[in-house]
Interface confidence: medium
Amino acid sequence: KVFGRCELAAAMKRHGLDNYRGYSLGNWVCAAKFESNFNTQATNRNTDGSTDYGILQINSRWWCNDGRTPGSRNLCNIPCSALLSSDITASVNCAKKIVSDGNGMNAWVAWRNRCKGTDVQAWIRGCRL
């Protein structure tokens, strides 16, 4: 599923991401835009043999199990395929664990490079939330 901007903002708010660990909803929508272009089925492979999955591009070395990543930790205790569902519950729950891990949203390279320090509220402007 490819979400619309406001559709995703509403879904993320319903799942309790607005101001989760101090990060406003705009940060999460911005991260999803530049990680996956709002596509729940996005996958991208990394040079270390891991793969990033889903709307927030969650990594298989640390956070989920795809059955084939060397030394996978699966800290969210889920199959990576669950992160590709049109229902973003699994991605949100895992993202909450990631953002609580110490580095905050810096865990997402795209957020660090494209969203951090920008007007992230623009990503929810005009949305009925």
Epitope: Q41, G49, G67, R68, P70
Partner: antibody, heavy 116, light 107 residues
Amino acid sequence: QVQLQESGAEVMKPGASVKISCKATGYTFSTYWIEWVKQRPGHGLEWIGEILPGSGSTYYNEKFKGKATFTADTSSNTAYMQLSSLTSEDSAVYYCARGDGWYCYWGQGTTLTVSS
Amino acid sequence: DIELTQSPATLSVTPGDSVSLSCRASQSISNNLHWYQQKSHESPRLLIKYASQLQSGIPSRFSGSGSGTDFTLSINSVETEDFGMYFCQQSNSWPRTFGGGTKLEIK
């Protein structure tokens, strides 16, 4: 138990296309990558690429881009590989395998012969 | 691409002998190396995963070792059913690659 059942042998003319199937049973098809491997005598085993059936995500070995196309049907638990513009170089045994990094589960192989 | 070089290409042995097959990677692949046996007209069969982990159902006479670039598959006291081709495969990076194979034949 996990099984992968491939379609039968094919004899094709040069320039034609062929679609090989791989039906999976015994596990959740959508959650594991399906890999495709080519074997020609004297050429060993070559990795063609992979598809994640649940999302349709595909990755191809550069060498096979434009030659192979992967699809999957989660309603029938079947993965497909189409090979186009066939030449004698495409004559080989083609295997599907479940992608766990290693390959514990293989299909029985589909023999493709390209001959005029 | 990571190249895997297997040696020797052919190994002629008598049942009861112990043998070692080599697989060398063109760059370090940690322990992300797997071994397969293939008999004529059959699909490959996984023997060892991650360099040294014996796959379930595989006889204990098979063992694997190595890390980085140099790997070895050992067969302690070869049996007649062990003759065939042996391939190594790396899962450290894409594209996945296989070695050219070692043929284990009866002397």
